[in-house]
Interface confidence: low
């Protein structure tokens, strides 16, 4: 006999004998038990052996049983969620073996000092691994590699130094991140790699700003909007990110992110990304949006441009996501705005002088009469980036501009895949002649189309850069027009502001803006890097248009892209997919590679 | 058809005992859960205890300790042995088979009647 | 426990009518998971042992006329007869099935006007 309760949920027994004083598991539980809540016991020990013939159970709750050793010598097949926190647990066995379906491991507030190289083998299903409030100092190299389908990974509160510089390698579907509160000094150059986090914490760390440090800072910068400060109690997705909680413990707790790095050599590869304090004058390889759409906060994250190889001047690549999958929560598009320092929260604040982009090019494909590669003939509503100028706070169906914070959301059902490729050549100078208008017609066959033209010209090399103005029509839920001013920021030597002027009106929500038409051109912008150097016209390969157009010297140039009813689709740009990029010709590592 | 015939009831002093059964027909006995329910003269429905086709008991706390229940599935046969039998254990006990797991009772018995008086 | 409340403690109504009783549970008796209220009524006559009516709220066991529903979720529950009729005078019994121990309500007593 037992004190324990039942309770149904679907189709598995729940059995609870929380707080009964209990020293061992009872000897009289339901056979098909399937979530057995043993916590606030003094069990003292614990073996997976006296469950092995619970053959239903998928929950084991043993917090805060006192338990100061497991013993992982019965096979759990079944068992999804273990939670073992608030023990007194000094080390953990192999796991893998015994729990080899487990998806969620809770280890916080124990005794941890140290994790075995091997601890995770075996745990390939493992989502959420919860390592809070331990005496970590460090972590074996390796130790996530086992687990390539982590979501959630919780370091917080232990007393890390240092990271292994792999530790994230392969962990594409991670989305949080926990590291506050530990004792880091840096994190190791390419360490995040090419992943999307949507939400990361590192603040009360013990950063130390030198030039080590510059590729965090970089990181920092393109991931501004996904860096948050943990509160007790706070869901993270009701806060707003806060990249400045992450602070140089030996420079007066200054942000990290605008830590100058005056002095740092730029060429000795301290960093994955370029300096901007000093790039080369070459063409950018790639600019590259990526969003998420697992959660309610769609935050645009910019990679920074890399300068391409001064041989390569021929012949680059922007390079755009493999066919979207509707169950992957990320996306890649490719975005017009450069991700300069004003798309920083509005508590940051800029400073041109530390990061100024030198180069940026920007591509925006035109309809064309390719299908996708899902051979979806109708323009149902696809993958389409909408950028809407308004900080994380603002409803998601606000018109209220907000111009310093870029928000990038996208339909969380879409089946259309997104462009795959495009290659970009670059001619000599002066050898291409440059159109300077483009006609943009909206296609709506129940009214008048609405014309959208931009006017650009083309100056001469020299330090001014030319003002421009573009009228476009965005299908909002409103009528109310909303004017949009961005001020745009120029190259540093230039010694005249570039003002862009985008006037925005709103029609009744009937009037649904489905398409460009399909002689609209692709739009690439290029950036000098300096005011002497002639202009770089970068051509984009007419693989589906007939015209282009050249938008020279604009430090940024920003398309203003509706939520509900977008009118700018992404067609496919060239016929290569996911699958087939291996032997793609496209893809040489000469040139830019696929993202995840 | 489902039957349920309980039998062992009887008038008992405080701290006595008694044996309860339950003789069950009609069914696949060992394929479901088995449950005591009482009703006190006058009041109202109490679970008194359960046992799962897998032979594991359950009991509310008024009766932990002193009653025990177990079945025999060779027999078809639930019981229900209750001691430190006190004056509010007076009422009419019903054996019942449970749906699924201890939950909603779908047939009843007709009842034994247990008094514990002086 | 979770503590069953019935209203009212007796109820009388012409025979045709409609008669409705209310059951309430101290806590939520949905499970988020499969979306199901565990709650089951029964009728109990007059030296009878008690009858399953309905349960999962509105599940009818089979055999039980249909005048008789269920309704209602989370901790708010409702048996109607549609229609009353003479032999549906009893005592009606609410229960959760939802967490052990179980527990019952105390019982309306529908009587004929």
């Known amino acids: 006999q037992h004190t324990c309760s039942i309770s149904k949920v679907t189709s598995l027994l729940e059995v609870n004998c929380e707080n009964k004083k209990l020293t061992a598991l009872p000897a009289d539980l339901p056979a098909d038990t399937g979530i057995l809540h043993l916590g606030e016991n003094q069990l003292g020990t614990f073996s997976t052996a006296s469950l092995v013939h619970f053959t239903h159970l998928t929950y084991l709750y043993l917090d805060r049983c006192e338990l100061t050793s497991l013993q992982t010598n019965g096979k759990l097949i079944k068992l999804e969620n273990l939670d073992l926190s608030h023990n007194n647990l000094k080390s953990l066995p192999s796991l893998g073996w015994a729990l080899p379906a487990l998806t969620t491991l809770d280890v916080s507030f124990n005794k941890l000092g140290s994790l075995s190289p091997g601890v995770l083998d075996g745990l390939s299903q493992l989502q959420e691994l919860y390592l809070q409030n331990n005496d970590l100092k460090s972590l074996p190299p390796g130790l996530l590699l086992p687990t390539t389908k982590l979501k959630k990974l919780n370091l917080a509160n232990n007393k890390l130094r240092e990271l292994p510089s792999g530790l994230l390698d392969g962990l594409e579907d991670l989305d949080t991140l926990y590291l506050q509160r530990n004792w880091l000094r840096t994190i190791p150059k390419g360490f995040f790699g090419t992943l999307l986090l949507p939400f990361v914490f590192l603040h009360a760390n013990s950063w130390y700003c030198d030039c080590e440090i510059l590729y965090f800072r970089h990181w920092l910068q393109e991931n501004a909007n996904n860096v948050y400060l943990w509160k007790q109690g706070v869901d993270v997705k009701d806060t707003t990110p806060n990249v400045a909680s992450v602070r140089c413990a030996n420079l007066d707790n200054a942000p990290v992110y605008s830590y100058p790095g005056k002095g740092c050599p730029t060429s000795s590869g301290d960093t994955d990304y370029d300096d901007y304090d000093d790039i080369p004058d070459v063409p950018a390889t790639r600019t590259e949006v990526k969003f998420s759409t697992n959660t309610k906060v769609h935050t645009t994250h910019w990679s920074l441009l890399a300068a391409a190889p001064s041989t390569s001047q021929d012949s680059q690549m922007i390079s755009l996501p493999p066919t979207h999958k509707p169950t992957k929560k990320q996306s890649t598009f490719i975005h017009t705005q450069s991700p300069g320092f004003t798309t920083l929260p509005e508590t940051m604040e800029s400073n041109p002088t530390f990061y100024s982009l030198k180069l940026n090019t920007v591509l925006i494909p035109s309809p064309t009469t390719l299908e996708p590669t899902s051979t979806q003939a109708t323009p149902e509503p696809n993958i389409q980036p909408m950028l809407t100028t308004s900080t994380l706070t603002t409803p998601e169906h606000s018109t209220t501009p907000v111009p310093t914070t870029t928000i990038l959301t996208t339909p969380e059902h879409s089946t259309i895949p997104v462009p795959t490729t495009a290659i970009l050549t670059t001619p000599k100078p002066s050898t291409i002649p440059v159109p300077t208008t483009a006609t943009l017609t909206t296609l709506e066959p129940s009214t008048t189309p609405v014309p959208t033209t931009a006017t650009l010209t083309t100056p001469e090399p020299s330090t001014t850069l030319v003002p421009t103005t573009a009228t476009l029509t965005t299908p909002e839920h409103s009528t109310t027009p909303v004017p949009t001013t961005a001020t745009l920021t120029t190259p540093e030597h230039s010694t005249t502001p570039v003002p862009t002027t985008a006037t925005l009106t709103t029609p009744e929500p009937s009037t649904t803006l489905t398409n460009l038409v399909s002689t609209i051109s692709p739009v690439l912008t290029t950036t000098l890097t300096t005011p002497e150097s002639t202009p770089i016209e970068t051509i984009l390969e007419q693989f589906f248009t007939t015209e282009l157009t050249l938008l020279p010297t604009l430090e940024s140039t920003t398309t203003i892209i509706p939520e509900q009813n977008s009118f700018l689709n992404l067609p496919e740009v060239a016929l290569v997919s996911s699958d087939t990029s291996e032997s793609s010709p496209f893809l040489n590592s000469d040139f830019c590679c696929f993202l995840p | 058809e489902v039957q349920l015939v309980e039998s062992g009831g009887g008038l008992v002093k405080p701290g006595g005992s008694l044996r309860l059964s339950c003789a069950a027909s009609g069914f696949t006995f060992s394929s479901f859960a088995m449950s005591w329910v009482r009703q006190a003269p006058g009041k109202g429905l109490e679970w008194v205890s359960s046992?799962?086709?897998?032979?594991?008991?359950y009991y509310p706390d008024s009766v932990l300790g002193r009653f025990t229940i177990s079945r025999d599935n060779a027999k078809n046969s639930l019981y229900l042995q209750m001691n430190s039998l006190r004056a509010e254990d007076t009422a009419v006990y019903y054996c019942?088979?449970?749906?699924?797991?201890?939950?909603?009772?779908?047939?009843w018995g007709q009842g034994t009647t247990v008094t514990v008086s002086r | 426990d979770i503590v069953m409340t019935q209203s009212p403690d007796s109820l009388a109504v012409s025979l045709g009518e409609r008669a409705t009783i209310n059951c309430k549970s101290s806590?939520?008796?949905?499970?988020?998971?499969?979306?199901?209220?565990?709650l089951a009524w029964y009728q109990q006559k007059p030296g009878q042992p008690p009858k399953l009516l309905i349960y999962?709220?509105?599940t009818r066991e089979s055999g039980v006329p249909d005048r008789f529903s269920g309704s209602g979720s989370g901790t708010d529950f409702t048996l109607t007869i549609s229609s009353l009729q003479a032999e549906d005078v009893a005592v009606y019994y609410c229960q959760q099935h939802y967490s052990s121990p179980w527990t019952f309500g105390g019982g309306t007593k529908l009587e004929i006007k």
């Open positions: 999962f709220t509105s």
């Open positions: 046992i799962t086709s897998a032979g594991t008991p």
């Open positions: 806590q939520s008796l949905l499970n988020s998971r499969n979306q199901k209220n565990y």
């Open positions: 019942a088979r449970s749906r699924g797991y201890e939950d909603y009772f779908d047939y």
